[in-house]
Each structure stands twice: as structure tokens, then as C-alpha cells.
């Protein structure tokens, strides 16, 4: 179980690196973030570490109310601050693992 979660964490972070460069990866991460109401791996601040992402931006899928451009110059109160690894991990533990 721990190994699966560790792999999921590493994979999620890897996909974040590819987010600005790969539309397919972006759509998968967007779906996960929107469905699980989460943002980033550990939390939303993970997005500022992605070199090709502007530091005042998170994907629109992080927004509580998703609209085009809502992640640009974001305010913390308008986005999901919890990380996806913990949120999705909890769901996996309960439903799959």
C-alpha cells in the first residue's frame, strides 16, 4: 500500500512537470484536480515550482468555481488548497487498496 502511494506521488509530480508541455497530461491532471477538489501534489504551492508555469498561476482546474483564466493571479480563497496525493490517496485506500 505504501509503495503504491509513493509511486502515485512520484507519478503525479512527474505529470505536473509535463503539464504545460503536454495537452493529454494536462487534461488528465485537470480532471483529477477538478473531480477531487484538490490542487498540486502536496498542496497548491507545488505549482509555483514548475519552471514553465508563471509563479502567480495555478491550473484553472484548481479553482473552486472553474472558469477560463480563474487560475491566473489566483487568490488562495478562490482555489482548492489541499493536495491531490493525500486526497486521491485517501479515496484509493478506501475504495481500491
Amino acid at each position: 500500500r505504501d509503495k503504491v502511494m509513493s509511486e502515485f506521488n512520484n507519478n503525479f509530480r512527474q505529470q505536473m512537470e509535463n503539464y504545460p508541455k503536454n495537452n493529454h497530461t494536462a487534461s488528465i491532471l485537470d480532471r483529477m484536480q477538478a473531480d477531487f477538489k484538490c490542487c498540486g501534489a502536496a498542496n497548491y504551492t507545488d505549482w509555483e515550482k514548475i519552471p514553465s508555469m508563471s509563479k502567480n498561476r495555478v491550473p484553472d482546474s484548481c479553482c473552486i468555481n472553474v472558469t477560463v483564466g480563474c487560475g491566473i493571479n489566483f487568490n488562495e480563497k478562490a482555489i482548492h488548497k489541499e493536495g491531490c496525493v493525500e486526497k486521491i490517496g485517501g479515496w484509493l485506500r478506501k475504495n481500491v487498496l
Epitope: 502567480n56 493571479n73 478562490a78
Partner: antibody
Framework: QVQLVESGGGLVKPGGSLRLSCATS????????MNWIRQAPGKGLEWVSY????????YYADSVRGRFSISRDNAKNSLYLQMSSLRADDTAVYYC????????????WGQGTTVTVSS | DIQMTQSPSSLSASVGDRVTITCRAS??????LNWYQQKPGKAPKLLIY???SLQSGVPSRFSGSGSGTDFTLTISSLQPEDFATYYC??????????FGQGTRLEIK
Amino acid sequence: QVQLVESGGGLVKPGGSLRLSCATSGFTFTDYFMNWIRQAPGKGLEWVSYISNSGSIRYYADSVRGRFSISRDNAKNSLYLQMSSLRADDTAVYYCVRDPRQIYGMDVWGQGTTVTVSS
Amino acid sequence: DIQMTQSPSSLSASVGDRVTITCRASQSISSYLNWYQQKPGKAPKLLIYAASSLQSGVPSRFSGSGSGTDFTLTISSLQPEDFATYYCQQSYSTPPITFGQGTRLEIK
């Protein structure tokens, strides 16, 4: 009504330190990012630093990075700027500024506090 | 970093004139452009946000337009209290938050 009141400015020698404070009232402090913006005598506006609602994110202008530190106390509705290794070119009026972010501009500014660095 | 360039840097006009100030960004900033007014010895005041939205309490003679890299602030009929310095500012890609160098509007 919404108020931002800066304090802590004054005359300091080069290499010295100063701590600016900004007391806020009339709004929910944690709903906003906060900025420090300065203006040297006769010059334009220069962004210094900003901090996110919770304090998780903090950024600085290249000109002050490593010398200045921004912080906030959400329990006291206050913003701070710790300034060290001060130089003559840090002489300016320092404004505390509220920022709702997203498409909105910086909508409320304090009256400013003057910092003079001179020997 | 995104550079903001205002023109002109100073401008003389008379009460009742229509005045236009321009601001150009070094790269596209969509509509993430704000305009501020500053009077001597006072703090700046937000006039226009999102390129064309009038901030609450600002007179309707002020208007903004543009998107991408080119923006304008227009004062349709100058009033005595409008003589001040005007700054544009981008919030599309930060840090840093960047301002134009300012346009000083003087009485002719």
C-alpha cells in the same frame, strides 16, 4: 471603513535595520494578498514584496531579496516588512497595499511611511 | 520580466480637453492591466482594473481599453482635479509586479 495604516518609518544609517508595520481594519484581512510598494523621492512606483492570504507564498523584488522579509499576523490583521542591510537607494515612501488578485487591481493603499537611509 | 512602457511621460492639457495615455507591455498580458492616479503627497488610487472596468466611485469620464500588449487610458473631459500622475500596472505574470514609469498630466 477600510483602513491601512503604516508605521515604523524613520531615519536610519546605511547598514541599519527597520521594521515597518501596517495595521488594517474594516475588512476580512485573510481574504487578501498584501503588498509593500515603495516610491523614491521624485520617482515612480516600485513593487517590493507580496505575501499570500495564509503567508504560504512570499516574493520579493530583486533589489531587496535577501535583505527584506515580509510577514503577516492574521490574528492581529497586520502586515510587516523587516528591512536590514539598508542602503541609500532604499530611501522611499513605503506603502502597504491590499490586493484582491485575479482580474482586480490593488484597490486600497495606506498613506505611506517614509524611510530615509542616510549617514 | 514584463516591462511596461507609458507614453507620453508628461502631457500638458486644458480643462475640458480629451486626453489619452498609452501603455505598452513587452509581451501579451491579456486584460490584466490596471490604471492608478496619484496626486502629489498622496497614495495612488485605483481607477481602472482589468483594462476597462471602472473602479467603484471613479467618475465615468475615465475609461480604459485594450488587450494583449497595447492599452489606453482616456479622460473624456479634463477636470481641475484630474491633474496628477497616472501609472499602468500588469498583474498577468508576477513576480515581479511591474508598473509603467508614469505620465505626468499638467495644466497648460
